[in-house]
Amino acid sequence: LIIGFGISGRHSITVTTVASAGNIGEDGILSCTFEPDIKLSDIVIQWLKEGVLGLVHEFKEGKDELSEQDEMFRGRTAVFADQVIVGNASLRLKNVQLTDAGTYKCYIITSKGKGNANLEYKTGAFSMPEVNVDYNASSETLRCEAPRWFPQPTVVWASQVDQGANFSEVSNTSFELNSENVTMKVVSVLYNVTINNTYSCMIENDIAKATGDIKVTESEIKRRSHLQLLNSKAS
């Protein structure tokens, strides 16, 4: 926990943030909580970002106060106004940009005192992979596709039957730049697959890790995928 020290005779209050990651082009949340106050009008929330001339967001006297907001964040920020009274100062950030990454400060003033905590926000692109059987190929082949990643991830194949096997010699991965010139489509092909086996396509960068599984039997194909954000930790 990072505790902001009180000044002018006020006590310090505890402010807690959680490091998180934003998916560019989508909406993100910068999490921040504090010791609640009984009067909404006594609560001031300020979000600041290292390297930004103006404020990211300010909420005071029960409403947004955006006269000092930086142009880079204009129209893209909101707090959860109905949850401020219970100590939620989290910020919703619309249309996350790559350049939104950095160190943010959640600064709180209440009738009890003042406090702040920093938050490291990472940005990138991450998406669920889908693994399919490639029926067009000459041999039994699997194709793993994920539409949006940034920075460029690593792709590793694994198999339930051949645990620990290295599939780099029998796989081929390509990265195709998407139209907005930042994110990339990931395509990885695995050759010489065997029936009655479960294969996993694991895609990972410093923001997220995603896995697509496929189980191929004589009678059916079962798929499953999941995505996990990395390095989410509380301050």
Partner: antibody, heavy 118, light 107 residues
């Protein structure tokens, strides 16, 4: 069209003071952050100070902190840099720079020369 | 402070050449980087912001790329009016810092 016009430069003795002004037009001045960037003769660019659109948040290069003060008058569309305790190493062309919609170094004035010499 | 190491400091090239200038930041800057062009006796002019975005009116022969701490400005086919000095600038952290500049001269 965005226009930034600096004035107030000149020759000043070491230890002296000078106030630079930058008159802005062609955009909603109060919405945008502004900076001063300087360039010593024959040298590269150096950011000196910045201020947000509302004027409440100011930032400085360590070597000018306590000597320079950035301010703005949004009613007059004017940015200022009050410089005191000037040193020979402050000699440079001082540029007024405006933030655009996405970026802090979008629009540049033509610069005003400050020479600190005895 | 974030140090911006720009290379080369100067280069000689001919009209039509492809020119590449790089900037390395002393830490990751998440594409908070711009590229500027300056001609002798003139104020700098913004070319690229956020690492890859072209300013309005800047010819498409200019492009930016990179991520993390390493960024590149490319001029795909050098034109006579492109002979100038180019600077990168980071705005991820105060104080904002510039690269040392790259002077592009006629061969």
């Amino acid at each position: 069209e965005v226009q930034l016009l600096e004035s107030g430069g000149g020759l000043v003795q070491p230890g002296g003071s000078l106030r630079l002004s930058c008159a802005a037009s062609g955009f909603t001045f109060s919405r945008y952050g502004m900076s001063w960037v300087r360039q010593a003769p024959g040298k590269g660019l150096e950011w000196v100070s910045g201020i947000n659109g509302g004027g409440s948040y100011t930032y400085y290069l360590d070597t000018v902190k306590g000597r320079f003060t950035i301010s703005r008058d949004n009613a007059r569309n004017t940015l200022y840099l009050q410089m005191s305790s000037l040193r020979a190493e402050d000699t440079a062309v001082y540029y007024c720079v405006s933030q655009g919609s996405n970026y802090y170094f979008d629009y540049w004035g033509q610069g005003t020369l400050v020479t600190v010499s005895s | 402070d974030i140090r911006m190491t720009q290379s080369p400091s100067s280069l000689s090239a001919s009209v039509g050449d492809r020119v590449t200038i790089t900037c390395h930041a002393s830490q990751g800057i998440s594409s908070n980087i711009g590229w500027l062009q300056q001609k002798p006796g003139k104020a700098p002019k913004a070319l690229i912001y956020h690492g890859t975005n072209l300013e309005d009116g800047v010819p498409s022969r200019f492009s930016g790329s990179g991520s993390g701490a390493d960024y590149t400005l490319t001029i795909s086919s050098l034109q006579p009016e492109d002979f100038a000095t180019y600077y990168c600038v980071q705005y991820a952290q105060f104080p904002y810092t510039f690269g040392g500049g790259t002077k592009v001269e006629i061969k």
